[in-house]
């Protein structure tokens, strides 16, 4: 089976690497524009230069291309706690990240929110906080893990998953209650 190619890929595959087919004349291969530039005019003929212009401020192209417009620079999302790691240049998009002691949680492929790394109070750090993953905590005896925080077993309701982890404490509480009812 031959993989389906889009029109642009079909057109590009006829020309050697770094060139593309002239949209009006498929016997001409034009040189692609360098990163940081965009296509202003196709080359007039074989062996003649493509007219490429530099991207304007606030836009970029990160690879060789024959785009009619540069791409708009991304903005870091303040409401998601993002900070700018590096500014947009003509050949590279803005790089956004999180502050120190924070990690990225991806809600979707291209949307992340910054959250504080868990400190593992009433527990120990099992795995340190990473760029894209929160600290993994192990809780001390008498505590159970809920939403990556160590919570006292006194907050464990019998119906919750914590009952297995807090079983000795729950039994003790039950035993104390029983002894008081004789």
């Amino acid at each position: 089976l031959v993989p389906h190619l889009g029109d642009r890929e079909k057109r590009d595959s006829v020309c050697p690497q770094g060139k593309y087919i002239h949209p009006q004349n498929n016997s001409i291969c034009c040189t692609k524009c360098h990163k940081g530039t965009y296509l202003y005019n196709d080359c007039p003929g074989p062996g003649q230069d493509t007219d490429c212009r530099e991207c304007e401020s606030g836009s970029f192209t990160a690879s060789e291309n024959h785009l009619r417009h540069c791409l708009s620079c991304s903005k870091c999302r303040k409401e998601m706690g993002q900070v700018e790691i590096s500014s947009c240049t003509v050949d590279r998009d803005t790089v956004c990240g999180c502050r120190k002691n924070q990690y990225r949680h991806y809600w979707s492929e291209n949307l992340f929110q910054c959250f504080n790394c868990s400190l593992c109070l009433n527990g120990t750090v099992h795995l340190s906080c990473q760029e894209k993953q929160n600290t993994v905590c192990t809780c001390h005896a008498g505590f159970f893990l809920r939403e990556n925080e160590c919570v006292s077993c006194s907050n464990c309701k019998k119906s919750l998953e914590c009952t297995k982890l807090c079983l000795p404490q729950i039994e003790n509480v039950k035993g104390t209650e029983d002894s008081g009812t004789t």
Epitope: R77, K78, E79, M80, H105, W107, Q113, F115, N116, N134, E147, N148
Partner: nanobody, 119 residues
Framework: EVQLLESGGGLVQPGGSLRLSCAAS????????MVWVRQAPGKGLEWVSH????????YYADSVKGRFTISRDNSKNTLYLQMNSLRAEDTAVYYC????????????WGQGTLVTVSS
């Protein structure tokens, strides 16, 4: 007590429009960025759109970009989602929520409103 009440869902034909509303109470609405998420039958939660406190910065998932518009009226404590050019794949229960702060979970959200796109 935080309450979020979605409305405006219903049955609509492909290409049609709907406007969802979310009435908020029990917190200072104007201080909170707000989110629309949806859950299609048998699928997980999908982030649809969010809006900052003042309604200036917005975000849209690629699947709805150019078709949906999020807005808010802080004087009415209400969040909106204008949905145009609806497609069958937009069929889902739509929920509004406060943007999470402490961790990646929704502490408060409504009961949802069902949007069905079908001919």
């Amino acid at each position: 007590e935080v309450q979020l009440l979605e409305s405006g869902g219903g049955l609509v034909q492909p290409g049609g429009s709907l406007r969802l509303s979310c009435a908020a109470s029990g917190f200072t609405f104007a201080h909170e960025p707000m989110v629309w998420v949806r859950q299609a039958p048998g699928k997980g939660l999908e982030w649809v759109s969010h809006i900052d406190r003042v309604g200036q910065d917005t975000y849209y998932a690629d699947s709805v970009k150019g078709r949906f518009t999020i807005s808010r009226d802080n004087s009415k404590n209400t969040l909106y989602l204008q949905m145009n050019s609806l497609r069958a794949e937009d069929t889902a229960v739509y929920y509004c929520a406060k943007l999470p702060k402490r961790g990646p979970r929704f502490d408060y959200w409504g009961q949802g409103t069902l949007v069905t796109v079908s001919s």
